[in-house]
Interface confidence: low
């Protein structure tokens, strides 16, 4: 089953369907019963499984935090996809929360990259073109830009 195959009416969790395991494994969108005899469907919008598996129960769907937007809903075979709101981004070093993008670059630097859900604005030195990394500059040192309305970090 792919996400595209799921009809809109399946958003309402249907009765859990059963089928038989194949070589001890159940297909994506299912988990195995305690006795190993049945494959039981995950509940649409509540839990999921992505691979052939022998899980005793499906994996719980992620709920997007405040400060995140839901790009795609949880299906029986795919977890929810969440993304930081406009004006915030998620760093690799701290993936658990969305952080506010800087509003501008330090003096002597120019912006070469916008705020995206995956990265802060990117600044380079005017002369050398060297990238700048570090803390957000003090307000009086900034060259302002308009990255959109800043949002609160995700909780």
């Amino acid at each position: 089953i792919t996400q595209q195959d799921l009809a809109p009416q399946q958003r309402v969790a249907p009765q859990q369907k059963r089928s038989s395991p194949s070589e001890g494994l159940c297909p994506p969108g299912h988990h195995i019963s305690e006795d190993g005899r049945d494959c039981i469907s995950c509940k649409y919008g509540q839990d999921y499984s992505t691979h052939w598996n022998d899980l005793l129960f499906c994996l719980r769907c992620t709920r997007c935090d405040s400060g995140e937007v839901e790009l795609s809903p949880c299906t029986t075979t795919r977890n929810t996809v969440c993304q930081c709101e406009e004006g915030t981004f998620r760093e690799e070093d701290s993936p658990e929360m969305c952080r506010k993008c800087r509003t501008g670059c330090p003096r002597g630097m120019v912006k070469v990259g916008d705020c995206t859900p995956w990265s802060d604005i990117e600044c380079v030195h005017k002369e050398s073109g060297t990238k700048h990394s570090g803390e957000a500059p003090a307000v009086e040192e900034t060259v302002t830009s308009s990255p959109g309305t800043p949002a609160s970090p995700c909780s």
Epitope: G24, I32, N53, L55, F57, R60
Partner: nanobody, 122 residues
Framework: EVQLVESGGGLVQPGGSLRLSCAAS????????MGWYRQAPGKQRELVAE???????NYADSEKSRFTISRDNAKRTVNLQMNSLKPEDTAVYYC????????????????WGQGTQVTVSS
Amino acid sequence: EVQLVESGGGLVQPGGSLRLSCAASGSIDSINNMGWYRQAPGKQRELVAEITPRGRTNYADSEKSRFTISRDNAKRTVNLQMNSLKPEDTAVYYCNAEVRERGTSWYRPDYWGQGTQVTVSS
């Protein structure tokens, strides 16, 4: 409440063996995957091996030939047999379990033991 208690760590010479055990207890309805992770000083916690309820295993590449994970579903235990130990295996070893507590519908993947120290040194 759910508890995971590890045992079996200690000091061993290079080339030696150890058997780690972990027992889960408490308000448990069902246990999904169980596994062993380790954390060496100054390094991130990393997966060593994990095992599904029906015995399917997954090992970190470097440990595949030397380590063996096993579990007893009835006793809610998971073991890690470690052979041909090397100094780089020195770390704190943690047991992990994905547990569904009684009265709940979901497993939680974040149950951890306190850890047991394994030191490989001559």
